[in-house]
C-alpha cells in the first residue's frame, strides 16, 4: 500500500505509479519538462527527495479521449 511523504525508488516506484495511475499510464517527467527529463523528474522528486500522492498523480498520463 502507498504510504504518503516517503521516498520511492527502484521497482517500488514503478509499481506505485502503476497503481496510482491505473489505466492512464504515466511518464517519468511531466510533459512541460520533457527537454530535461533525464536530469529531473520523478526519480529525483520521489526517490531522492520525498513524494506524496498528489505529486505522483502529476506524472499520470492524460487518458486518451474516446471518439
Amino acid at each position: 500500500a502507498y504510504r504518503p511523504s516517503e521516498t520511492l525508488c527502484g521497482g517500488e516506484l514503478v509499481d506505485t505509479l502503476q497503481f496510482v495511475c491505473g489505466d492512464r499510464g504515466f511518464y517519468f517527467s511531466r510533459p512541460a519538462s520533457r527537454v530535461s527529463r533525464r536530469s529531473r523528474g520523478i526519480v529525483e522528486e520521489c526517490c531522492f527527495r520525498s513524494c506524496d500522492l498528489a505529486l505522483l498523480e502529476t506524472y499520470c498520463a492524460t487518458p486518451a479521449k474516446s471518439e
Epitope: C9, G10, G11, R38, V43, E44
Partner: antibody, heavy 126, light 107 residues
C-alpha cells in the same frame, strides 16, 4: 569501450581517510545514477552508496552514514567516494557500478547494475 | 530493509548437470531481482534482470524465474566456465541488498 576504472585504494590506519575515484568511459555518464558496492575479503556483496545523475541527491547504507560521502564530476566523467573515520570493518574491494536504465524514449524503468569496474582494495589496519 | 537469502551456500556439480539456485526475499519484491556471476578476483557480471530477462551476451543456458518472494536461477547444462559464485540482488527499494552468495564448485 564502455568501462569503469576505480583507483585510490590502499592501506590506511583506523580513523584515517581515503578518497576513491571511478573513471567512466564509453557512455553518457551524466545520464546515469552511479553506485559503490563493496566486498569484504571472502564475503558477499554489499551496496554502499548511490548518487543521482545530476549529483545533487545521494543514498547511503546505514553503516557508512556520516562517514562516507559520494560525489561526482560529470564534466570529468568521474565518480568519487570520500571515506573518513575508517574502521577495520570497512576493509573491502570497492566497486563502482552503473545503474538506472532507460527505455527507448528515455524513461527510467530499471535499476540493476549492468556495468561494474574491476574494483580497488581498501585495507584498514594498524 | 529487505533481506535476501540464497540456498544452498555451496553446490557441488559436474559438467552437464542442471543446477538450480534459490533466492528468497523477506518481503515481496515483485520481479525486481537481478542475478550476478562472480569469479575469484573479478567484478560481478550481470546475468539476469527483472527476475527472468537474460542480459545481452549471456548464454541461453542461464534462466531466471519467480516473483514475489521466491526466485530461482537455473543453469540447464553446467559448463566449465560456469564454476563461480552467484548472487541475487533486489532493487525493489533502498537499500539495495544482495544474497550471501552460492558457490558452484566442481564435484
Amino acid at each position: 569501450e564502455v568501462q569503469l576504472l576505480e583507483s585510490g585504494g590502499g592501506l590506511v590506519q583506523p580513523g584515517g581517510s581515503l578518497r576513491l575515484s571511478c573513471a567512466a568511459s564509453g557512455f553518457t555518464f551524466s545520464e546515469y545514477e552511479m553506485s559503490w558496492v563493496r566486498q569484504a575479503p571472502g564475503k558477499g556483496l554489499e551496496w554502499v552508496s548511490s548518487i543521482y545523475s545530476s549529483g545533487g541527491w545521494t543514498k547511503y547504507t546505514d553503516s557508512v552514514k556520516g562517514r562516507f560521502t559520494i560525489s561526482r564530476d560529470n564534466s570529468k566523467n568521474t565518480l568519487y567516494l570520500q571515506m573518513n573515520s575508517l574502521r577495520a570493518e570497512d576493509t573491502a574491494v570497492y566497486y563502482c557500478a552503473k545503474g538506472v536504465h532507460y527505455d527507448s524514449s528515455g524513461l527510467p524503468i530499471d535499476w540493476y547494475f549492468d556495468l561494474w569496474g574491476r574494483g580497488t582494495l581498501v585495507t584498514v589496519s594498524s | 530493509d529487505i533481506q535476501m537469502t540464497q540456498s544452498p551456500s555451496t553446490l557441488s556439480a559436474s559438467v552437464g548437470d542442471r543446477v538450480t539456485i534459490t533466492c528468497r526475499a523477506s518481503q515481496s519484491i515483485s520481479s525486481w531481482l537481478a542475478w550476478y556471476q562472480q569469479k575469484p578476483g573479478k567484478a560481478p557480471k550481470l546475468l539476469i534482470y527483472k527476475a527472468s530477462s537474460l542480459e545481452s551476451g549471456v548464454p541461453s543456458r542461464f534462466s531466471g524465474s519467480g516473483s514475489g518472494t521466491e526466485f530461482t536461477l537455473t543453469i540447464s547444462s553446467l559448463q566449465p566456465d560456469d564454476f563461480a559464485t552467484y548472487y541475487c540482488q533486489q532493487y525493489n527499494s533502498y537499500p539495495w541488498t544482495f544474497g550471501q552468495g552460492t558457490k558452484v564448485e566442481i564435484k
